[in-house]
């Protein structure tokens, strides 16, 4: 009885209905189901289409711009559970721009295990106010159900029996009012007794076994469930998979050979993005979690001793990294079996991207070549690189080769970085911003001192355009307020004082004291530091009464730690000898101040003598919040309340808004227009700042979702057809 058909992979069905027939024998879709972009379909095309075997979707269901589809009641009459293991932008059910959809009609949908519902811009869609989503999912407040026909009160939804004056469907409470619950004019929403939790119940309200989810054909029997709360094994719902079975995809039990087959199928296929499944914690999962590596004899994940190695073998023994995309191919690698050539001329947010993709590399068996990488300022993105073996060398016996890098200023922060080069020499030519002191430091640290020959490190073309600071600037005065920091530092003058053009003050927010100068910098404009140019002070002839240069930093965030350093800006001297000075990075915290107001206050009266008040913490605490002050004041009763005739016709019952306790924009507009009609003279009140802000946030949220949807949905045509269950796109 449980899952009578097949387990099918996730599907993306678009353009026309031909692939929809692949759903015919599916009981479970292990993955997501997307049906979208069908502009030529008509209502009659869907008349005889039905997939009654489909019971469960493990990820999400997305319907987008499918023309002619008016209801899902025939298409998926028995869809009971959407598990939401992977979500589409936090949603397990998305119905978006379905221009002809009149009703959802998923009358057997009993449970959305994770995630919420987004039903938006469906201008024919009714029967939404008649669904009690709280009986289907937990996080109703995260549902986003707007801009449907239902919003305009044009629907006139009629539940079964209503036309004959009967109430056939269950009623549940909204805003103190009992409302009948139905999916269509002929299908009630099934509402089980609360004692049944989400396990479901029979038609007569007898609870299903607690291992069931959503529905069952008989009560109190784990073999008679329609879907399982935890795991499915041999026709029965079970709490966990007993040995020798493994948990798979969060819903079923599989044996070792099933997992092994998946592993080998992927290993032997050339398909990108497939997973070589492994076994960990009694689960058959796509890959070992971090800190574990696979034992190839039994597929078990075993803990790594120290960081886990991931050896990446390079085809033809070398790889050129010329973009973020090519760097992504080495993501997670810890050992490079081969040589790397870095040739990056431009890109967006480069330092961060390179660190994310190359930052785990600890060892390179061959050589490392940095060539014409105009975009690089530092090599600190190789955060963990500790060893270059030099087993294969660049022509001339070089294991580290840096040529023509116009903006390279730092190799690594040698006070924090160790690098050993086992064999081979260093080569440095035409790196105009890289000081020789930096290169010599590398020779010492890497153990290559004495290996280089005379022309391996060019004295004239390295650091020739740099301010190679050799003096330390010290801060002499620091004062803080909640939004300002006043700094002074010791004066610095080069041998020819006219060479000092000024100082550059660098600062940024730094929650942790682990910042280095070149973090987040590249030569393409990305710089996580804010830079202030400061003129030199007036020069006094008396060395004892020198003015200390300084700067008042304004507009800072309260109770925030900043990293700060200052360096000189000096002219380039003809003798190819540039002086300069730079401070260490210091950390200064601004003072605390008043917090911003607490957010989203909600008050509810739960009895005649109590009011419950809830709020969220302020967005800007501006310090450690120790307590809140609550003020209240008794208000005089509104005399209108006593004078109003409550039997007046035209008084409407309150209707539920989608995310209590706040009213949606649409219901506010509706209420205003009603008021205008009755009052005649009145105009609507101007919107408050908070209303305007809320509307801006709402529209920004809508745009973000639409952008996400379009990015995921509109993909270039593939030459091969079909997408597998492991389609990595949304999660």
């Amino acid at each position: 009885h449980l899952y009578p058909g097949e387990v099918c992979p996730g599907m993306d069905i678009r353009n026309n209905l031909t692939r929809l027939h692949e759903l015919e024998n599916c009981s479970v879709i292990e993955g997501h189901l997307q049906i979208l972009l069908m502009f030529k379909t008509r209502p009659e095309d869907f008349r005889d289409l039905s997939f009654p075997k489909l019971i469960m979707i493990t990820d999400y269901l997305l319907l987008f711009r499918v023309y002619g589809l008016e209801s899902l009641k025939d298409l998926f009459p028995n869809l009971t559970v959407i598990r939401g293991s992977r979500l589409f932008f936090n949603y397990a059910l998305v119905i978006f721009e379905m221009v002809h959809l009149k009703e959802l009609g998923l009358y057997n949908l009993m449970n959305i295990t994770r995630g919420s519902v987004r039903i938006e811009k469906n201008n024919e869609l009714c029967y939404l106010a008649t669904i009690d989503w709280s009986r289907i999912l937990d996080s109703v407040e995260d549902n986003y159900i707007v801009l449907n026909k239902d919003d305009n009160e044009e629907c006139g939804d009629i539940c079964p029996g209503t036309a004959k004056g009967k109430t056939n469907c269950p009623a549940t409470v909204i805003n103190g009012q009992f409302v009948e619950r139905c999916w269509t004019h002929s299908h009630c929403q099934k509402v089980c007794p609360t004692i049944c939790k989400s396990h479901g119940c029979t038609a007569e309200g007898l609870c299903c076994h607690s291992e069931c989810l959503g529905n069952c054909s008989q009560p109190d029997d784990p073999t008679k469930c329609v879907a399982c709360r935890n795991f499915y094994l041999d026709g029965r719902c079970v709490e966990t998979c007993p040995p020798p079975y493994y948990h798979f995809q969060d819903w079923r039990c599989v044996n070792f050979s099933f997992c092994q087959d998946l592993h080998h199928k992927c290993k032997n296929s050339r398909r990108q993005g497939c997973h070589q499944y492994v076994i960990h914690n009694n689960k058959c999962i796509p890959e070992c979690p971090s800190g574990y590596t696979m034992n190839s004899s039994n597929l078990l994940c075993t803990p790594c001793l120290g960081p886990c190695p991931k050896v990446c073998h390079l085809l033809e023994g070398e790889k050129t990294i010329d973009s973020v995309t090519s760097a992504q191919e080495l993501r997670g690698c810890t050992v490079i079996n081969g040589s790397l050539i870095i040739n990056i001329r431009g890109g967006n947010n480069l330092a961060a991207e390179l660190e994310a993709n190359l930052g785990l590399i600890e060892e390179i068996s061959g050589y490392l070549k940095i060539r014409r990488s105009y975009a690089l300022v530092s090599l600190s993105f190789f955060r963990k690189l500790r060893l270059i073996r030099g087993e294969t060398l660049e022509i001339g016996n070089y294991s580290f080769y840096a040529l023509d890098n116009q903006n390279l200023r730092q190799l690594w922060d040698w006070s924090k970085h160790n690098l050993t080069i086992t064999q081979g020499k260093l080569f440095f030519h035409y790196n105009p911003k890289l000081c020789l002191s930096e290169i010599h430091k590398m020779e010492e640290v890497s153990g290559t001192k004495g290996r280089q020959e005379r022309n391996d490190i060019a004295l004239k073309t390295n650091g020739d355009q740099a301010s190679c600071e050799n003096e330390l600037l010290k801060f002499s005065y620091i004062r803080t307020s909640f939004d300002k920091i006043l700094l002074r530092w010791e004066p610095y003058w080069p041998p020819d004082f006219r060479d000092l053009l000024g100082f550059m003050l660098f600062y940024k927010e730094a929650p942790y004291q682990n910042v280095t100068e070149f973090d987040g910098q590249d030569a393409c404009g990305s710089n996580s530091w804010t830079v202030v140019d400061i003129d030199p002070p007036l020069r006094s002839n008396d060395p004892k009464s020198q003015n200390h240069p300084g700067w008042l930093m304004r507009g800072l965030k309260p109770w925030t730690q900043y990293a700060i350093f200052v360096k000189t800006l000096v002219t380039f001297s003809d003798e190819r000898r540039t002086y300069g000075a730079k401070s260490d990075i210091i950390y200064v915290q601004t003072d605390a101040t008043n917090p911003s107001v607490p957010l989203d206050p909600i008050s509810v009266s739960n009895s005649s003598s109590q009011i419950i008040l809830k709020w969220k913490p302020p967005s800007d605490p501006n310090g450690n919040i120790t307590h809140y002050l609550v003020f209240w004041e008794r208000q005089a009763e509104d005399s209108e309340l006593f004078e109003l005739d409550y039997c007046l016709k035209g008084l409407k019952l309150p209707s539920r808004t989608w995310s209590p306790p706040f009213e949606s924009e649409d219901s506010q507009k509706h209420n205003q227009s009603e008021y205008e009609d009755s009052a005649g003279e009145c105009c609507s009140c101007p919107k408050t700042d908070s209303q305007i802000l809320k509307e801006l946030e709402e529209s920004s949220f809508r745009k973000t979702f639409e952008d996400y949807l379009h990015n995921v949905v509109f993909v270039p045509r593939k030459t091969s057809s079909g997408t597998g269950a492991e389609d990595p796109r949304p999660s």
Epitope: P170, A171, T172, V173, F178, V191, P193, T194, I195, C196, K197, A203, E204, G205, L206, C207, H209, S210, E211, P219, D220, D221, P222, E239
Partner: antibody, heavy 115, light 106 residues
Framework: EVQLVESGGGLVKPGGSLKLSCAAS????????MSWVRQTPEKRLEWVAT????????DYPDNVKGRFTISRDNAKNNLYLQMSHLRSEDSAMYYC????????WGQGTLVTVSA | DIQMTQSPSSLSASLGGKVTITCKAS??????IAWYQHKPGKGPRLLIH???TLQPGIPSRFSGSGSGRDYSFSISNLEPEDIATYYC????????FGGGTKLEIK
């Protein structure tokens, strides 16, 4: 044939504790939710507690929450009700009943809370 | 909490006659109501669940009906063994019993 036999009732002082047991037979005990229901001296029936088949889900009415604990041992086919901080209004005949619709009941065990 | 108001609290009828007991819920209970017969010294016995569904082995003299908040239970062709106290139970939102109706034979 379904059989439920309660035991453990007796006389107890206010503030005292008592543990009731219910032995089940004639059905697959581990498949069924079980409940305790009591009948007061005024002949009113009151639901006391319910526990799901596997023991993961438990519900109580407000008047016993925090004082009574329902539990089960599926290996022994036994249902239990641990009662503490007893009050005089807890005096009643206590029945164990099967499943969420109380389709089968035992004969009951009498609990008297009195000084 | 849902309250169940059962009436009458007692009634007397003749053998072969018909009796009707009503239960009114304080809110909608979606037909989730059951009826029990209780005789002294025994545990209660389930007669009807889901408003009108007879338990296996229960004679068709027993019947139930209702919807929304109002429900009724009837016994026709009264027999001597029907002397008992009858209770309604709502199980829509947790459980609440009615106050009971004691049935006697005239």
């Amino acid at each position: 044939e379904v059989q439920l036999v309660e035991s453990g009732g007796g006389l107890v002082k206010p503030g005292g504790s008592l543990k009731l047991s219910c032995a089940a037979s004639g059905f697959t005990f581990s498949n069924y939710a079980m409940s305790w229901v009591r009948q007061t001296p005024e002949k009113r029936l009151e639901w006391v507690a319910t526990i799901s088949d596997g023991g993961h889900y438990i519900d109580y009415p407000d008047n016993v929450k925090g004082r009574f604990t329902i539990s089960r041992d599926n290996a022994k086919n036994n249902l239990y009700l641990q009662m503490s901080h007893l009050r005089s209004e807890d005096s009643a005949m206590y029945y164990c009943a099967r499943a969420t619709n109380f389709a089968y009941w035992g004969q009951g065990t009498l609990v008297t809370v009195s000084a | 909490d849902i309250q169940m108001t059962q009436s009458p609290s007692s009634l007397s009828a003749s053998l072969g006659g018909k009796v009707t007991i009503t239960c009114k819920a304080s809110q909608h209970i979606n037909k989730y109501i059951a009826w029990y017969q209780h005789k002294p010294g025994k545990g209660p016995r389930l007669l009807i669940h889901y408003t009108s569904t007879l338990q296996p082995g229960i004679p068709s003299r027993f019947s139930g009906s209702g919807s929304g908040r109002d429900y009724s239970f009837s016994i026709s062709n009264l027999e001597p063994e029907d002397i008992a106290t009858y209770y309604c139970l709502q199980y829509d939102n947790l459980y609440t019993f009615g106050g009971g109706t004691k049935l006697e034979i005239k």
